[in-house]
Amino acid sequence: GCINITSSASQEGTRLNLICTVWHKKEEAEGFVVFLCKDRSGDCSPETSLKQLRLKRDPGIDGVGEISSQLMFTISQVTPLHSGTYQCCARSQKSGIRLQGHFFSILFTETGNYTVTGLKQRQHLEFSHNEGTLS
């Protein structure tokens, strides 16, 4: 089987959503957990994570081969405390398989803005913290 994990971010007003998306086959879901860690380069686990989610066992319909499961971690207002390195991971409690997404970072600047970097190649998001706009 092939399980794919991606990281993304979206902004709604002053809120920042950090999103871990896992694509997987129905039969691969059992025992799988997706989780988001901060500043945990070596020991990212569900126990040390900011948030965790069991993968969907059922896509809700039968005419699909793959299921998308999405973990969303919402920061209502980004502060300097949120600066750091984040990583989406997944682990099977059944088979021991472990997946690690790319590291991405939130950098809070002195001007009160913040940037999110490393989500995808060539993708660099810069958010204005005060005005809540994508610049």
């Epitope: 969907k56 066992r57 059922d58 809700g60 319909i61 039968d62 005419g63």
Partner: antibody, heavy 121, light 107 residues
Framework: QVQLVQSGAEVKKPGASVKVSCKAS????????MQWIRQAPGQGLEWIGA????????QYTQKFRGRATLTADKSTSTAYMELSSLRSEDTAVYYC??????????????WGQGTTLTVSS | EIVLTQSPATLSLSPGERATLSCRAS??????LHWYQQKPGQAPRLLIK???QSISGIPARFSGSGSGTDFTLTISSLEPEDFAVYFC?????????FGGGTKVEIK
């Protein structure tokens, strides 16, 4: 044993909103899609939408998108269906139903007893 | 969306007779079709899953067949308690949809 218990009958005026609850017991609430279906007097079954409590993924039929809101509270194993801007045509029995696990059951194997909504001025 | 068309709308039969109900999908849905029975004042009850698979507790006189776009629910010998409305439902794609129903009434 699996049980779905819905809230009681409601009488609402046109333009108002209603929130129907469906309390689940006897299974792992987060692992199964909860469906919402309605049936107008003397009519067939109409699917409104479904929610997966594990990650709050919700799907709606086009007709109800923007007017129906499905939510789920994992701490109480309760699903909710809120319908806004009510009109007389919304008078119906509203059911919650659990979809059995894909490829094993797939159909709606357990149903609530139904909640009667009457919209009248 | 996938439209399910049930026929006939009403079936008038006597106890002991064989009932054949049809459900046609507007596009291929493999075997992703389920059948329900509903009696007045009651919630529907799942009879057949995935076109032809039996459900525990449902009498053996109920059987289903078909794949793709054409499906059939057969009641081999009608019992008095079988007079009800029957619905088909597809789980192939969003939005999920029901057929309009077939009422099986006593002749």
């Amino acid at each position: 044993q699996v049980q779905l218990v819905q809230s009681g009958a409601e009488v609402k005026k046109p333009g108002a909103s209603v929130k129907v609850s469906c309390k689940a017991s006897g299974y792992t609430f987060a692992d199964y899609w909860m469906q919402w279906i309605r049936q107008a007097p003397g009519q067939g079954l109409e699917w409104i939408g479904a929610i997966y409590p594990g990650d709050d993924d919700a799907q709606y039929t086009q007709k109800f998108r923007g007017r129906a809101t499905l939510t789920a509270d994992k701490s109480t194993s309760t699903a909710y269906m809120e319908l806004s801007s009510l009109r007389s045509e919304d008078t119906a029995v509203y059911y919650c139903a659990r979809r059995g696990i894909a490829a094993v059951v797939g159909g709606f194997d357990y149903w609530g007893q139904g909640t009667t909504l009457t919209v009248s001025s | 969306e996938i439209v399910l068309t049930q026929s006939p709308a009403t079936l008038s039969l006597s106890p002991g007779e064989r009932a054949t109900l049809s459900c046609r999908a507007s596009q291929s849905i493999s075997n992703h079709l389920h059948w329900y029975q509903q009696k007045p004042g009651q919630a529907p009850r799942l009879l057949i899953k995935y076109a032809s698979q039996s459900i525990s507790g449902i009498p053996a006189r109920f059987s289903g067949s078909g794949s793709g776009t054409d499906f059939t629910l057969t009641i081999s010998s009608l019992e008095p308690e079988d007079f009800a409305v029957y619905f088909c439902q597809q789980s192939n794609s969003w939005p999920l949809t029901f057929g309009g129903g077939t009422k099986v009434e006593i002749k």
